[in-house]
């Protein structure tokens, strides 16, 4: 039951998660105008990964495309890449996800081809959730960096009267979503990778060992492969089905005897 | 055919209140940001207030802020300008100006404007 | 706050006469993140309220002569009427729509 439960939360908290990066690709307040200086501007600058807008006091917003592609800074085309490759892999993730769900049975699919669908999804959510943070904090990190040099070139034109203000940037809320976005990715990759060794099979242990006289090579190890990997043993009793050993998340579900779905 | 209409203005004492008026007609009132523009007797125009459509927000000049107020009621059509504590430098033709959606915050239509004389 | 410098005060002209009329802000009108201008121009007749002439600069209101032609970037801004007629006769405001308060000239007279 407990493997179901990690497995199910996994998805959904990587579904959660994903939606979130690609709501965050999506969105036009990566960065906003600073309003330290000027708390009250009548126009208000804010940009994206795709297109910047002009927030006017009249209620009109108008954007405008970046539909220049070599003219991008390479750091903003990095970003863009990162958070692109990070919703591929989370979307074919969740895909893979669903079929691999312990609830849910496709025909005759062995367990162990669901343990295989299971760790290979959280590695996806992982390093989906890791390209959307890696992402971000590029996008972040540059923008810190601007920040800094605009306001060290704040005013220009100091001799005359006339002063020429830089509009500084600071961070947007899309930021915030791809942090906690990718976040959630990551921790639901983990998740399913947990419930992927909760998953996977004991026939191949059980196959390998002869029960033969004491004097055969191969020690017999009740908890099976469970006992060699760290899981702790298992001394209960197997259910014995086609001729090899299978049970269903027998140290998660403990103390109930059997999880079936 | 856009028509804004100012009211309220009159003669009144040093310390004393005004509440002005302007109805709005001949376009979509919620949608739009409005503004109050006063002109001194010298004939300078002086930005007084402005309120964004939903009335979220409003903006004044510094001379007048805490002393006036700025509302608006979408479904009259009408916006109020609350003014307490005059000065005699709050004497001035009061318009009504509204905001163009995509006219760069500049105001394209105005009313006649009424008239506020602060004087003991 | 933003200074609206407008020059002259006042202008005497004949009709069919070619003006232009100055403003200067005393900082950057232009936003970066559009590249827009946001300084308007109007018009204002004896005994009615100012006229929305020019928006974003140049921008010409619709029903505007195209005898009107506003130019200019950044802090220096210029209002032309390429030949005078006699209804032109009227003060000329600029304004700084840019930045809260949205501040204007002292005004240009243009008189016969």
């Known amino acids: 039951m407990a493997v179901t439960a990690c497995q199910g939360l996994g998805f959904v908290v990587s579904l959660i998660g994903i939606a979130g990066i690609i709501a965050a690709t999506c969105m036009d307040q990566w960065s906003t105008q600073d309003l330290y200086n000027n708390p009250v501007t009548a126009v208000f600058n804010y940009q994206g990964l795709w297109r910047s807008c002009v927030r006017e006091s009249s209620g009109f917003t108008e954007c405008r495309g970046y539909f220049t592609l070599l003219g991008l800074p390479a750091m903003l085309q990095a970003v863009r890449a990162l958070m692109i490759v990070g919703i591929v892999l989370g979307a074919i993730g969740l895909l893979v996800s669903i079929f691999a769900l312990k609830c849910i049975r496709i025909g005759s699919m062995e367990d162990s081809a669901k343990a295989n669908m299971t760790l290979t999804s959280g590695i996806m959510f992982i390093v989906s959730g890791l390209c959307a943070i890696a992402g971000v904090s590029v996008f972040a990190n540059m923008l810190v960096t601007n920040f800094w040099m605009s306001t060290a070139n704040m005013y220009t034109g100091m001799g005359g009267m006339v002063q020429t203000v830089q509009t500084r940037y600071t961070f947007g809320a899309a930021l915030f979503v791809g942090w906690v976005a990718g976040g959630l990715t990551l921790i639901g990759g983990v998740m399913m990778c947990i419930a992927c060794r909760g998953l996977a099979p004991e026939e191949t242990n059980y196959k390998a060992v002869s029960y033969h006289a004491s004097g055969h090579s191969v020690a017999y190890k009740p908890g099976g492969f469970k006992a060699s990997t760290g899981f702790g043993s298992n001394t209960k009793n197997k259910k014995i089905y086609d001729g090899g050993a299978r049970t269903e998340d027998e140290v998660q579900s403990y103390p109930s005897k059997h999880d079936y779905v | 055919e856009v028509m804004l209409v100012e009211s309220g203005g009159g003669l009144v004492k040093p310390g004393g209140s005004l509440k002005l008026s302007c109805t709005a007609s001949g376009f979509t009132f919620r949608s739009y940001t409005m503004s109050w523009v006063r002109q001194t007797p010298e004939k300078r125009l002086e930005w007084v207030a402005t309120i964004t459509g939903g009335g979220g927000n409003t903006y004044f000049l510094d001379s007048v802020k805490g002393r006036f107020t700025f509302s608006r009621d979408n479904a009259k059509n009408a916006l109020y300008l609350q003014m307490n504590s005059l000065r005699s430098e709050d004497t001035a033709l009061y318009y009504c100006?509204?905001?163009?959606?995509?006219?760069?915050?500049?105001?394209?239509?105005w009313g006649q404007g009424t008239s506020v004389t602060v004087s003991s | 706050d933003i200074v609206m410098t407008q020059s002259p005060s006042s202008l005497s002209v004949s009709a069919g006469e070619k003006v232009t009329m100055s403003c200067k802000s005393s900082?950057?009108?232009?936003?970066?993140?559009?590249?827009?201008?946001?300084l308007a121009w109007y018009q204002q007749k004896p005994g009615q309220p100012p006229k929305l002439l020019i928006y974003?600069?140049?921008t010409r209101e619709s029903g505007v002569p195209d005898r009107f032609t506003g130019s200019g970037s950044g802090t220096d801004f210029t209002l032309t009427i390429s030949s005078v007629q006699a209804e032109d006769l009227a003060i000329y405001y600029c304004?700084?729509?840019?930045?809260?308060?949205?501040?204007f000239g002292a005004g240009t007279k243009l008189e016969l």
């Open positions: 304004q700084n729509d840019h930045t809260y308060p949205l501040t």
């Open positions: 974003g600069a140049s």
């Open positions: 900082q950057s009108l232009l936003n970066s993140g559009n590249q827009m201008n946001y």
């Open positions: 100006a509204r905001l163009g959606q995509t006219q760069r915050n500049a105001m394209d239509y």
